[in-house]
Interface confidence: low
């Protein structure tokens, strides 16, 4: 018996071939011997089966001795043994129809779970293997679960259903709703304007929700809400903003925040949350601000950084075009009695400069100049 696998909602063509290459009488029946369709001369005739409005054949092939049964908009319950009667012979074809659906919306928040459910005919014992867009393979039976969805899981999931050594492939488009970056860090000199950007890693026609930026300054004992905003059809409107600092927010996507000045008291970490309409849970992006200050007080030249730096980072003070005078894995370094000239304060990671601040040290009778 020939086995054919079909996909729910698709069209399947079951073949039936006569030895004579001409139009002769044929009938297609189901396992209950109920006639589905056949011919009377060159006319297609249909029986009383439940497939009546979804069954068809290809008249153009009859003259070649081919009498296919075409079933449109397949349903799981169409799974059956179909019998083609032609030339006093019977050809049996077993059709097995499968469906694969995502248990929830195909737009899921990062960190949520995806469950794929296989609909299969009674008596079948299929195996399923799905491949995520990043090449991860997941195997299962009637259900497949993927917990903790990541941004790279966005895209087309290809699932292969295997039954009787035959396979059928399903493609499901999954969109993981997330920010492009889980975390970002901004390095700024004291006084500079700070730009925070929160690009989304997906595009949808209409985007509505609300968001908030909570900030934990390094110098503060508790975190505070810096800004709250609404998102309506990709338009951003500020609801509430602190007076210090007074953030400005762009009116369009991507979400964009401007801090007029980087100051030591603002250095720290923030968490931007975005709650989307009709979605449970929130999107998160962490943002970090590191602020550098170089100062000269009497005979002491000091370089300091505030904010979430790691011990891997090197803080240095050097006279321009010379070797570093001091270089430490610390948040503050200083030089006593610095010689006159342009001094550089550098924050670097494995030799790569992340932040630089210059200060001009004048001969001892004058005051320092900060360029």
């Amino acid at each position: 018996k020939k086995v054919v696998l079909g996909k729910k909602g698709d069209t399947v063509e079951l073949t039936c071939t006569a030895s004579q290459k001409k139009s002769i009488q044929f009938h297609w029946k189901n396992s209950n011997q109920i006639k589905i369709l056949g011919n009377q001369g060159s006319f297609l005739t249909k029986g009383p089966s439940k497939l009546n409005d979804r069954a068809d054949s290809r008249r153009s092939l009859w003259d070649q001795g081919n009498f296919p049964l075409i079933i449109k908009n397949l349903k799981i319950e169409d799974s059956d043994t179909y019998i083609c009667e032609v030339e006093d012979q019977k050809e049996e074809v077993q059709l097995l129809v499968f469906g694969l659906t995502a248990n929830s919306d195909t737009h899921l928040l990062q960190g949520q779970s995806l469950t794929l459910t296989l609909e299969s005919p009674p008596g079948s014992s299929p195996s399923v293997q799905c491949r995520s867009p990043r090449g991860k393979n997941i195997q299962g039976g009637k259900t497949l679960s993927v917990s903790q969805l990541e941004l790279q899981d966005s895209g087309t999931w290809t699932c292969t259903v295997l039954q009787n050594q035959k396979k059928v492939e399903f493609k499901i488009d999954i969109v993981v709703l997330a920010f492009q970056k889980a975390s970002s860090i901004v390095y700024k000199k004291e006084g500079e304007q700070v730009e925070f950007s929160f690009p989304l890693a997906f595009t949808v026609e209409k985007l509505t929700g609300s968001g908030e930026l909570w900030w934990q300054a390094e110098r503060a004992s508790s975190s505070k809400s810096w800004i709250t905003f609404d998102l309506k059809n990709k338009e951003v409107s500020v609801k509430r903003v602190t007076q210090d600092p007074k953030l400005q927010m762009g009116k369009k996507l991507p979400l964009h925040l401007t801090l007029p000045q980087a100051l030591p008291q603002y250095a720290g970490s923030g968490n931007l949350t975005l709650a989307l309409e009709a979605k449970t849970g929130k999107l998160h992006q962490e943002v970090n601000l590191v602020v550098m200050r170089a100062t000269q007080l009497q005979k002491n030249l000091t370089c300091e950084v505030w904010g979430p730096t790691s011990p891997k980072l090197m803080l240095s003070l050097k006279l321009e075009n010379k070797e570093a005078k001091v270089s430490k894995r610390e948040k503050a370094v200083w030089v006593l009695n610095p010689e006159a000239g342009m001094w550089q304060c550098l924050l670097s990671d494995s030799g790569q400069v992340l932040l630089e601040s210059n200060i001009k040290v004048l001969p001892t009778w004058s005051t320092p100049v900060q360029p």
Epitope: R134, L151, G155, V175, Q180, P199, T203
Partner: antibody, heavy 124, light 107 residues
Amino acid sequence: EVQLVESGGGLVKPGGSLRLSCAASGFTFSSYSMNWVRQAPGKGLEWVSFISSSSSYIYYADSVKGRFTISRDNAKNSLYLQMNSLRAEDTAVYYCARERGDDYGDYEGAFDIWGQGTMVTVSS
Amino acid sequence: DIQMTQSPSSLSASVGDRVTITCQASQDISNYLNWYQQKPGKAPKLLIYDASNLETGVPSRFSGSGSGTDFTFTISSLQPEDIATYYCQQYDNLPYTFGQGTKLEIK
């Protein structure tokens, strides 16, 4: 038509500098991670540097670390490679290459679009 | 760094032949492997990504398989236009690394 066009190659003395540019067209440049890959005459391919779509992540091969700087200007649809302290062993055809992806994000690692390459010769 | 060892380094075959190139990674790279074709004087071209996926527009005579440390690239029926150097490349870890290449010639 999706394409990448490199420029800026040429003959330079050891210790010298060059700045390579790569102009992108036909796709949303700001959505894709980009790379520089080089090929010394008669030799194989060597990955040089990577930059993510919004420049958050930058990586270099050990052989160029501290001497080369990758950057991009998404407003100008351009990728750059600043090469300082050049050595004879940096002589190669330099290709800019796009990482496979789409407007939602990138799929790490496969270079689906390449430029025609620009020749850099370091010789005294 | 992950080393990629390709073999053979050169190969001579006739039109219509089945051609196989292998690539071995110095550590498990799952299926994070791509195959490229480079014709003389031209830029490389992506043929296979994720070890076995055929890039859009690439003829079906090209295929790839393997996982972990051992990978295979196959041309089912060699055509004259397939004369080129073929490279494997891993992207399990930065730095991305390429195999040394396999130069394919027609007998």
